[in-house]
Interface confidence: medium
């Protein structure tokens, strides 16, 4: 592009600028210790300082500690980035009753709809399950009309009447206090994301390309420096690589300078709800449970509600789906794997106190 040559020439001999062939213009070279906030900085104000690991640059240009999701009832929603805090939310199966900045101060288990009620809105990390009366002609066993099929479809009738509205009855939900490890964690294996980033893979950007080690004058090989664990997307923006820090995920491909990390379910698990470059929900495979079943959930951000099956029922245990598809396509409507120890302490949200019998089955404690 001959018309661009004059611009390129003006960069030569000017140590504070370099020519970026990608954008075909002169760019300001950020000084030592400073990093560009855009692909082609034009002035010193387009450069920023780097905060320490687990710190982010707030609106006042101060390095502020990212919140940690180290409590048992929290998981990482978004990672700690250069300009924003890590965000924590209640782990699947729980909702936030007392919010905190970028986190939640108190998480409660989702309520289970009582007999004669059906789920109107499934619980999320922010909201409890909302129930509504079953409409006439629809079996109370159906969570929604589209799920009212023959029992062979895997739908299990709801059990154990429990109050629903957190506004009227705080006793209907069970908080996790003092880091107590509840068996729901053992059953679902959905533990917290670690505070420290994954050490798997390689740095998302090559320190040799950092503006602290200026690129050769006029070099087109000097690409934008993204933060650790970020990649340069097609639009030239630094985008966070997905995190495989959930217990049920493993890294398939690492975070590279121009592509995201990809995650897949760990061995022995299959993806029930896919997500970009990752899996929103992994379930064990084969999927057999002795005492616990899950309600089907379609939306990735909506959480599974754990329930006890009605007495005398037992979910099917099929090593392979009935339609003969590969495990990856297995429906998430089957139950999660629970070992005999975990089933002894499975929380059953209920308005009455719960005791555990010697058999490990929850029993209602009348007082």
């Amino acid at each position: 592009f001959p018309q661009d040559r004059p611009f390129e020439d003006t960069c030569h001999g000017n140590p504070s600028h370099y020519y970026d062939k990608a954008v075909r213009r002169c760019c300001y070279r950020c000084p030592m210790g400073l990093f560009p906030t855009q692909q082609c900085p034009q002035r010193p104000t387009d450069c920023r300082k780097q905060c320490e690991p687990d710190y982010y640059l707030d609106e006042a240009d101060r390095c502020t500690a990212c919140v940690t999701c180290s409590r048992d009832d929290l998981v990482e929603k978004t990672p700690c980035a250069w300009n924003s805090s890590r965000v924590c939310e209640c782990r699947p199966g729980m909702f936030c009753s007392t919010s905190a900045v970028n986190s939640c101060a108190r998480c409660f288990f989702h309520s289970v709809c009582p007999a004669g009620m059906i789920v109107k809105f499934p619980g999320t990390a922010q909201k409890n399950t909302v129930c509504e009366p079953a409409s006439p002609g629809v079996s109370p066993a159906c969570a929604s009309p589209e799920n009212c099929k023959e029992p062979s479809s895997g739908t299990i009738p709801q059990a154990k009447p429990t109050p629903v509205s957190p506004a009227t009855s705080s006793a209907s939900t069970m908080p996790v206090r003092g880091g107590t490890r509840l068996a729901q964690e053992a059953a679902s294996k959905l533990t917290r994301a670690p505070d420290s980033p994954s050490s798997v893979g390689r740095p998302s950007s090559d320190p040799g390309l950092s503006p602290t080690q200026p690129c050769p004058e006029g070099s087109g090989d000097c690409r934008k420096q993204c933060e650790p664990d970020y990649y340069l997307d097609e639009a030239g923006r630094c985008t966070a690589c997905v995190s495989c820090s959930r217990d049920d995920l493993v890294e398939k491909t690492p975070c590279a300078w121009n592509s995201s990390r990809t995650c897949e379910c760990r061995p022995g698990m299959i993806c029930a709800t896919s997500a970009t470059n990752s899996c929103a929900r992994c379930v064990p495979y084969p999927i057999c449970a002795a005492e616990t079943v899950t309600k089907p959930q379609d939306m990735a951000e909506k959480d599974t509600t754990f329930e006890a099956p009605p007495l005398g029922t037992q979910p099917d245990c099929n090593p392979t789906p009935e339609n003969g598809e590969a495990p990856a396509s297995t429906s998430p409507t089957q139950s999660l794997l629970v070992d005999s120890q975990a089933s002894k302490t499975l929380p059953i949200p209920t308005s009455a106190p719960v005791a555990l019998s010697s058999t490990g089955k929850p029993v209602l404690d009348a007082g």
Partner: antibody, heavy 121, light 111 residues
Framework: EVQLQQSGAELVKPGASVKLSCTAS????????MHWVKQRPEQGLEWIGR????????IYDPNFQGKATITAYTSSNTAYLQLSSLTSEDTAVYYC??????????????WGAGTTVTVSS | DIVLTQSPASLAVSLGQRATISCRAS??????????MQWYQQKPGQPPKLLIY???NVESGVPARFTGSGSGTDFSLNIHPVEEDDIAMYFC?????????FGGGTKLEIK
């Protein structure tokens, strides 16, 4: 040449305060972070904290919160460490150091010669 | 806080031989695939001097006799061949988590 020039030795009484200085040459302190490190006689190194001279943003080791105050003046290219309510435990050499920060590295690349503080009645 | 444990506390090596100093962290200091561990040399009456940063990168001006290795929680500094000028205290330091912490130090002596 990049250098950090620290103020001279101090002999102070218990309960008093002292303010140490660290003047940079060869670079602008507002483009970096300035750290302070403590070293007691015949002992290891302890990180006290750091300041972003561009805006006064500080981070301290909780063990030094209340004991140490780090400030900086970009006009004089100088960082300061003030130590209050001094006791014999504060007798040490105090170093200032430049923090070098990158995409995958954070370290002290330039150190001052140190200032000896002796607390004695 | 991340605690760094250096071993040995003192080390006597013959000239021309190899000296190995270890540093173990109480938790991982990895950050996106890089171990945020540094090594410093300190001679009596002098400030510490940076030798190695990010586990294995040799600071400019430092002799190639100094090498760093390790990942996760275990790191080491190797000096080979050891020279008279290497008599000093050596400290490891992590910058993975605030507060940044140092190891207790290893005193290198010549046999």
């Amino acid at each position: 040449e990049v250098q950090l020039q620290q103020s001279g030795a101090e002999l102070v009484k218990p309960g008093a305060s002292v303010k140490l200085s660290c003047t940079a040459s060869g670079f602008n302190i507002k483009d970096t972070y300035m750290h302070w490190v403590k070293q007691r006689p015949e002992q290891g190194l302890e990180w006290i904290g750091r300041i972003d001279p561009a805006n006064g943003d500080t981070i301290y080791d909780p063990n030094f919160q209340g004991k140490a105050t780090i400030t900086a003046y970009t006009s004089s290219n100088t960082a300061y460490l003030q130590l209050s309510s001094l006791t014999s435990e504060d007798t040490a050499v105090y170093y200032c150091a430049r923090g070098y920060y990158g995409s995958s590295y954070w370290y002290f690349d330039v150190w001052g010669a140190g200032t000896t503080v002796t607390v004695s009645s | 806080d991340i605690v760094l444990t250096q071993s040995p506390a003192s080390l006597a090596v013959s000239l021309g031989q190899r000296a190995t100093i270890s540093c173990r962290a109480s938790e991982s200091v990895e950050y996106y695939g890089t171990g945020l561990m540094q090594w410093y040399q300190q001679k009596p009456g002098q400030p510490p001097k940076l030798l190695i940063y990010s586990a294995s990168n040799v600071e400019s001006g430092v002799p190639a006799r100094f090498t760093g290795s390790g990942s996760g929680t275990d790191f080491s500094l190797n000096i080979h061949p050891v020279e008279e000028d290497d008599i000093a205290m050596y400290f490891c330091q992590q910058s993975r988590k605030v507060p940044w912490t140092f190891g207790g130090g290893t005193k290198l002596e010549i046999k």
